[in-house]
Interface confidence: low
């Protein structure tokens, strides 16, 4: 799915050596210039230009400090493992002047029985083992330390936690003679937090647990547990928040029902039902109590688990999420779409929008896509004129101000941003789509016609003539 969109990726930089206990060299002064965007209410462009100029002027003094790489640290506690028993780990880039910590959970589907886990191990070993992980990763999108790429939290301590447990970050079972694979997703998060406390997280003001796709669902499943863990360890002052990207799925009726044969075609409810048993999956306690034994699978679905969560969570979800469409057996192969499928897709967008109506902090563009927050161009998409980094900044402010009695949204700083137009890519800022076969970029008008949308039907609710709509869409307005 990723191949259809045009996202810029930066090249890797040469790897520095690994660090087991991060710290400045003895006697080395620890300096940084933390900037807080809460103070910036004027011209953001002008401010960003000043920041860039400052960064460039400081670059010669501290080229090493601007290294974008996050470095790999395998867990010291090697009993907390990936599926194959190799130690789990995390990539870290510290920002010594900042008390903000961003922990990002990687995504990558799941497997829920011996057969499809064996197949996953053969084809996607990186998602089941740490053996071949690179020593460094470049932080992109919300993990970038460049203010232009990450105007939201560029100065934070960045942690990327690779997904190697195949359990939607929910498992709590180790590898044994009986179990061919370990499923320790929930335990990996706990152990990473435990080790990070020894690397400066203990001084954090805010911990933002973020994730995309299965990692986004992982945020919903683990955010309260992380907050509880920090409280128990004596750090109640660390504010734990969640950012769930592309992990808010619906347990809706599939477009075409298929038997539960593999990860992709199995209906999400059935896949998770089987998975929980196979992984010894754990779900948030308050959610678990709402369902009978054996019905814990319900807690993997955002709209069911969200109301039970105590931590603030910001939900980012494309209204026409490609992973959702895949599990619903909707495969857009490049052939024009029949009316039944078109209505199914539109209804999906409507249902998703409905589940977000009571989620105060949400960003849901009407696009056909999957994942956004660690894309380099995550700043480009807007909903009602507001970009995602701006919405997250407004969310931070709203949480900062929430001790005040007023519950009214901050003026000019919205956090509930859900597109209301009813068809895929009706938002002109959606990521560019490519024709799967020719590789050609398509503008929105081409895409909609390609999808079989009749311009008359699309234009009418907007009070436009088809020719006017085509003109608007072709100009990207």
């Amino acid at each position: 799915s990723e191949g259809r969109k045009t996202w810029r990726r930066r090249g890797q930089q040469p790897p520095p050596p690994p660090r087991t206990e991060a710290a400045p060299a003895a006697g080395q002064p620890v300096e940084s210039f933390p900037l807080d965007f809460t103070a910036v209410e004027g011209n953001m462009d002008s401010f960003m230009a000043q920041v860039k100029s400052l960064a460039q002027s400081l670059y010669p003094c501290s080229a090493q400090q601007l290294n974008e790489d996050l470095r790999l640290h395998l867990l010291l506690n090697t009993s907390v493992t990936c599926n194959d028993g190799s130690p789990a780990g995390y990539y870290l880039k510290e920002s010594r002047g900042s008390r903000r910590w961003l922990l990002f959970l990687e995504g990558g589907w799941y497997c829920f029985n011996r057969e499809n886990c064996d197949s996953r191990y053969d084809t996607m070993r990186r998602l089941m083992s740490s053996r071949d992980w690179p020593r460094t990763r470049t932080g992109t999108g919300i993990l970038s330390s460049q203010p232009e790429e990450n105007p939201y939290w560029w100065n934070a301590n960045m942690v990327f936690i690779p997904y190697c447990s195949s359990d939607v970050w929910s498992g709590a079972s180790s590898k044994s003679e009986k179990n061919e694979y370990a499923f320790m997703g929930a335990l990996i998060i706990q152990e990473v937090v435990r080790e990070l406390l020894g690397r400066g997280l203990s001084g954090a003001k805010v911990l933002l647990l973020a994730g995309s796709s299965a990692g986004g669902t992982g945020v919903l499943l683990n955010v309260d547990r992380v907050a509880e863990q920090l409280e128990k360890l004596g750090y109640p002052a660390i504010q734990v928040r969640g950012l769930a990207d592309s992990g808010w799925f619906l347990d809706n009726k599939q477009y075409r029902h298929t038997d539960c044969v593999d990860t992709i075609t199995c209906a999400p409810t059935e896949a998770i039902r089987r998975g929980i048993r196979y992984w010894n999956g754990v779900v948030p306690e308050r959610c678990r109590r709402q369902f009978q034994e054996g019905e814990e699978w319900n807690c993997f679905f955002g709209y069911k688990v969200y109301p039970t969560l105590r931590c603030p969570v910001f939900v980012v979800q494309w209204l026409f999420d490609e992973a959702q469409l895949t599990v619903d057996n909707v495969h857009l192969t490049g052939q024009p779409v029949q009316e039944g499928l078109r209505l199914y897709i539109q209804n999906l967008g409507r249902e998703l929008r409905h589940t977000l109506k009571d989620v105060p902090a949400s960003f849901a563009p009407a696009c056909l896509s999957h994942e956004i927050i660690i894309r380099s161009h995550w700043t480009d998409v807007q909903v009602k004129g507001t970009s995602l980094p701006r919405a997250l900044h407004c969310w931070d402010r709203s949480l900062h101000d929430s001790h005040k009695a007023s519950k009214t949204p901050l003026k000019g700083c919205p956090v509930h941003l859900v597109d209301s137009c009813p068809w895929p890519h009706c938002n002109p800022s959606c990521p560019t789509v490519r024709d799967q076969f020719t590789g050609q970029e398509m503008n929105v008008a081409q895409f909609l016609m390609h999808m079989g949308f009749d311009m008359q039907t699309v234009a009418q609710p907007q009070g436009l003539e088809p020719s006017e709509l085509l003109g608007m869409l072709s100009n990207g307005s």
């Epitope: 050596p17 690994p18 660090r19 087991t20 206990e21 506690n77 130690p87 435990r194 406390l197 203990s202």
Partner: antibody
Framework: DVQLVESGGGLVQPGGSRKISCAAS????????MHWVRQAPEKGLEWVAY????????YYADTVKGRFTISRDNANNTLFLQMTSLRSEDTAMYYC????????????WGAGTTVTVSS | DIVLTQSLASLAVSLGQRATISCRAS??????????MHWYQQKPGQPPKLLIY???NLESGVPARFSGSGSGTDFTLNIHPVEEEDAATYYC?????????FGAGTKLELK
């Protein structure tokens, strides 16, 4: 000058307790993970315990788990090892050592303090 | 636990010759391009002193006649040319997993 100085060793009865200390100087103590490593007379080196820079994470060798407690006082640049239920096989020279950031090796060692468990 | 075996308990080498001390791990101590094996020198009545870290990196202040090599399970410490002050016991140590373990040591004697 970077230095670690252990103290508090001595003769202890089997089943008894002892707390040994390690004073650090010449470096930012609170930034480093620290370990205790011991060496029985005429024997090799044995890792005993680890504590992270902020005191949150601790790990122990199975031989001492439940009996020894590693702790630190970052304000006073001091590392401790509280030993209880001591056995004759705990008789050793106890070294405190600093963990380097690059990969879990010990780049600074103290001169050691001797703990003898005997009746 | 990862067991480190130093096959030679002692080794006698003439001044100016090469001393080769080996260490074998019961399972690989390499990961992600790094080998978590380190070497220390210990003289009687003194604490150990770090010589080589991450298999092949020379600790600052250590003479260049010391070198380390190897990956996976087999590692070697070389001293060439051997000098009088090199008479000591040499230990390997891994940090690939917990518990951290040391080899039993190889005593280098001068002929």
């Amino acid at each position: 000058d970077v230095q670690l100085v252990e103290s508090g060793g001595g003769l202890v009865q089997p089943g008894g307790s002892r707390k040994i200390s390690c004073a650090a100087s010449g470096f930012t103590f609170s930034s480093y993970g620290m370990h205790w490593v011991r060496q029985a007379p005429e024997k090799g080196l044995e890792w005993v315990a680890y504590i992270s820079s902020s005191t949150v994470t601790t790990y122990y060798a199975d031989t001492v788990k439940g009996r020894f407690t590693i702790s630190r006082d970052n304000a006073n640049n001091t590392l401790f090892l509280q030993m209880t239920s001591l056995r004759s096989e705990d008789t050793a020279m106890y070294y405190c050592s600093r963990q380097n950031w690059d990969g879990g090796y010990f780049d600074v060692w103290g001169a050691g303090t001797t703990v003898t468990v005997s009746s | 636990d990862i067991v480190l075996t130093q096959s030679l308990a002692s080794l006698a080498v003439s001044l100016g010759q090469r001393a080769t001390i080996s260490c074998r791990a019961s399972k690989s101590v390499s990961s992600s391009g790094y080998s978590y094996m380190h070497w220390y020198q210990q003289k009687p009545g003194q604490p150990p002193k770090l010589l080589i870290y991450l298999a092949s990196n020379l600790e600052s202040g250590v003479p260049a006649r010391f070198s380390g090599s190897g990956s996976g399970t087999d590692f070697t410490l070389n001293i060439h040319p051997v000098e009088e002050e090199d008479a000591a016991t040499y230990y390997c140590q891994h940090s690939r997993a917990l518990p951290l373990t040391f080899g039993a040591g190889t005593k280098l004697e001068l002929k």
